[in-house]
């Protein structure tokens, strides 16, 4: 067999809200996949494991099951939605998304993936972590990489 | 306005347990957290743990988990820190703070001091 | 854990100076650092946290900067009331420790 390539994109768009009784913020991010099958039959994709980590801190879960068959030598963009929650030891952030005297209240995200492929009863699993940039203070819908987080000592507020 | 009031100084045997209270007044207790900070004989801070009314979460610096217990009174808005199996080390003013999160405490208690003495 | 390292350990100046007083982290904590003022005696006060946001109440002549490992708490124009001990504090992860402190006197 053939590679199984996955190549996480970036984040697609986050939509955010907040519960000003909780000092609470929930942030909807869609992220974006290219998983290429590199061989010359089908391959499944069973499903995608989904994690997001702000200040080493698990915020957010998503699983997709049953999600799309790639054909031979094909490639298939796929989107997943994690829903998380910054919250309570995180909520220092509170202050920092609302404010509104800054535009950009960009947070640096850990974004970790893990795909499940099958073909012929064979399982495969590859993982992928990234860090990126996300506006915790508006609804923002990103060009493809533009989210990518580069500097590691210098972040953007 | 905002305002933390602690319980008085404790004078304590070793070996013994005390349990400092601190009543929150002036915004919805349940809305921020309350964190606790020790500081002995004038000298550096240290974050104990800090607990969240709503839910009842708590989260401990590691080296205070056997040593302290975080809870929180909802009907009365008091917060509580009890000191367990106490020794000459546990003598300090204990501090507790209305909680931005993750410890940042932006109103302050007056402080208790405990004094553990044979 | 994560540590904090400050400097100076003690500082004299006169008012109207202007002083900055430092704190490291052990590894990149990104922005999330406080900055609190303790009078001897008193209770600690918020003054800055998020690295450069200014706590209610705070005087504009104190400021925060910095990112990653490395931050500043500048005074300008020292006033009377501002003598005392400093401390810096990350709020990135557990458990969220303070810098040894800095002991700001009058010259």
């Known amino acids: 067999p053939r590679s199984i390539d996955v190549k996480y994109i970036g984040v697609k768009s986050a939509y955010v809200s907040y519960d000003v009784q909780k000092r609470t913020i929930y942030l909807n991010i869609t992220n974006t996949l290219n998983i290429t099958n590199n061989n010359y039959y089908s391959v499944e994709v069973e499903n995608i494991t989904a994690q997001v980590q702000f200040s080493k801190t698990v915020i957010g879960k998503a699983r997709l099951n049953n999600i799309t068959i790639i054909g031979p030598l094909d490639m298939k963009q796929i989107d997943y939605t994690v829903p998380t929650v910054i919250a309570e030891e995180m909520s220092y952030m509170y202050d920092f998304c609302t404010l509104i005297s800054i535009k950009v209240h960009n947070i640096v995200l850990m974004m970790q993936v893990t795909v499940t492929t099958t073909y012929f009863g064979h399982s495969e699993q590859i993982s992928q972590e990234r860090y990126q940039y996300v506006d915790c203070g508006r609804n923002t819908t990103y060009q493809l990489g533009q989210s990518e987080y580069l500097n590691v000592l210098q972040p953007q507020q | 306005q905002v305002q933390l009031q602690q319980s008085g100084t404790e004078l304590a045997r070793p070996g013994a347990s005390v349990k400092v209270s601190c009543k929150a007044s002036?915004?919805?207790?349940?809305?921020?957290?309350i964190t606790w900070v020790k500081q002995r004989g004038g000298q550096g801070l240290e974050w104990i743990g800090e607990?969240?009314?709503?839910?009842?979460?708590?989260y401990y610096n590691e080296k205070f988990k056997d040593k302290a217990t975080l809870t929180a009174d909802k009907s009365s808005s008091t917060a509580y820190m009890e000191l367990r199996s106490l020794t000459s080390e546990d003598s300090a003013v204990y501090f507790c703070a209305r909680s931005k999160g993750s410890g940042t405490g932006d109103y302050w208690g007056q402080g208790t001091t405990v004094t553990v003495s044979s | 854990d994560i540590q904090m390292t400050q400097s100076p350990a003690s500082l004299s100046a006169s008012v109207g100076e202007t002083v900055t007083i430092t704190c490291r982290a052990s590894?990149?904590?990104?922005?999330?650092l406080a900055w609190y003022q303790q009078k001897q005696g008193k209770t600690p006060q918020l003054l800055v946290y998020?690295?450069?946001m200014l706590a209610e109440n705070v005087p504009s002549r104190f400021s925060g900067s910095g990112s990653g490992t490395q931050f500043s708490l500048k005074i300008n124009s020292l006033q009377p009331e501002d003598f005392g001990s400093y401390y810096c504090?990350?709020?990135?992860?557990?458990?969220?420790?303070f810098g040894a402190g800095t002991k700001l006197e009058l010259k």
């Open positions: 002036g915004y919805i207790f349940t809305t921020y957290g």
């Open positions: 590894e990149n904590i990104y922005i999330y």
């Open positions: 504090q990350h709020h990135y992860g557990s458990p969220p420790a």
């Open positions: 998020n690295g450069k």
């Open positions: 607990i969240y009314p709503r839910s009842d979460n708590t």
